[in-house]
Interface confidence: low
């Protein structure tokens, strides 16, 4: 498939509707208190973690999620069946790939089971949520006397549905050299100079072919090109983070 | 709820051209994604293109490229399909599909990108049959 005009809709809002049921007229008595958000990220299209603040709650409370799709022939809701725990109480859900269904609305209900009325839903888009793993295998080579190809792999997702973000300096530059690579993963960098020594690395994220995720991967592991005879103060330039 | 009735579909020899219409009524049709999938017998149902209503944005498949537009009115609340250069293994019942945007605090949100999968859509017609032969 091709994109022949980027999809203009609010595909940034991952947060669509966040529904806070509380309790009925009659028992307005005492406010309830709102639940946490919760936050989800498909990692690599392999899981999911649903996660939550717990210690936002006033008392240790074992929250309880569960979740649907918004069109499924089964609708209803399936509590989570992995609970991550911080400090022995629930502070996250892990969803396996078999239940991860990227393009359809993902309803997630975060509920409190000493008091039933005290729950809030949100609807999120997981094509937006996705977090790739760091690109792997970066390799270089030479494609002409004064050019280099920068080549990389990513596990698990079409190449087409990744965006990169390449990296690059000499150890005689301050800063980064940054640039955006689509759906190829090789960069070439034109000219080089045999004399410095090149540092690479690469992220990527699942933008903007197949989802709209603002969430970079971990950078890849640095690759090095060209001579180790020039010598500079590494201070000033070690990787950052 | 949406309903979607397709029509347009017949015989035609390869190298000619069709033009398939499908009519959405029963809802807003504003912010839909709209898509044309096919299904030839045995064979999974494929997605063939598609078009958000919203922004214009269009999806092709590679197969389709260059010999199928998808348009749509939105006056008159109807979806085509531009069918030229048909080749024998255009064959297939031609299916209009539409995904509705689901409501977000910031205005409606299409929850798709690509147009590819089945399961991105609501509502379904049921279908017009294409055959190209000679």
């Known amino acids: 498939w091709s994109s022949k005009v980027l999809m203009s809709s609010a595909n940034e809002d991952i947060k669509a509707d966040l529904i806070l049921t509380s309790t009925a007229p009659e028992h307005l008595s005492a406010p309830t208190l709102p639940l946490p958000e919760v936050q989800c990220f498909v990692f690599n299209i392999e899981y999911m973690n649903c996660t939550w603040n717990s210690s936002s709650e006033p008392q240790a409370t074992n929250l309880t999620l569960h979740y649907r799709y918004k069109v499924s022939d089964n609708n209803t809701f399936q509590e989570c069946s992995h609970y991550l725990f911080s400090k022995e109480i629930t502070s996250g859900c892990q969803i396996q790939k078999e239940d991860i269904q990227l393009y359809q609305t993902f309803v997630v209900q975060l509920q409190d089971p000493q008091k039933p009325q005290r729950r809030a839903v949100q609807k999120l888009n997981l094509q937006n949520l996705v977090i790739p793993r760091a690109p792997e295998n970066l390799t270089l080579s030479n494609l002409s006397e004064s050019q280099l190809e920068l080549r990389w792999k990513s596990r698990h997702i079409k190449e087409r549905c990744l965006q990169y973000l390449v990296q690059y300096r000499s150890n005689r530059d301050r800063s980064w050299t940054e640039l955006i690579v689509n759906h190829e993963p090789r960069f070439s960098l034109p000219s080089v100079d045999e004399l410095k020594r090149y540092t690479f690395r690469v992220r990527s994220r699942y933008n903007p072919i197949c989802g709209s995720s603002q969430q970079w991967s971990k950078w890849s592991q640095p690759v090095h090109w060209g001579s180790h005879t020039v010598e500079e103060n590494p201070s000033l330039f070690a990787l950052e983070a | 709820q949406v309903q979607l009735q397709e029509s347009g579909g017949g015989s035609v020899q390869p190298g000619g051209s069709l033009r398939l219409s499908c009519a959405a009524s029963?809802?807003?049709?504003?912010?839909?994604?709209m898509g044309w999938f096919r299904q030839a017998p045995g064979k999974e149902r494929e997605g063939v293109a598609a078009?958000?209503?919203?922004?214009?944005?269009?999806y092709y498949a590679d197969s389709v490229k260059g010999r199928f537009t998808i348009s749509q009115d939105n006056a008159k609340n109807t979806l085509y399909l531009q069918m030229n250069s048909l080749k024998p293994e255009d064959t297939a019942m031609y299916y209009c599909?539409?995904?509705?945007?689901?409501?977000?605090?910031?205005?409606?949100?299409?929850?798709?990108?690509?147009?590819?999968?089945?399961?991105?859509?609501?509502?379904w017609g049921h279908g017009t049959q294409v055959t190209v032969s000679s």
């Open positions: 029963g809802s807003t049709y504003a912010n839909y994604l």
């Open positions: 078009i958000y209503s919203g922004g214009g944005s269009t």
């Open positions: 599909a539409a995904a509705s945007a689901v409501k977000g605090d910031k205005g409606d949100i299409v929850v798709v990108v690509t147009g590819t999968q089945r399961m991105e859509y609501d509502y």
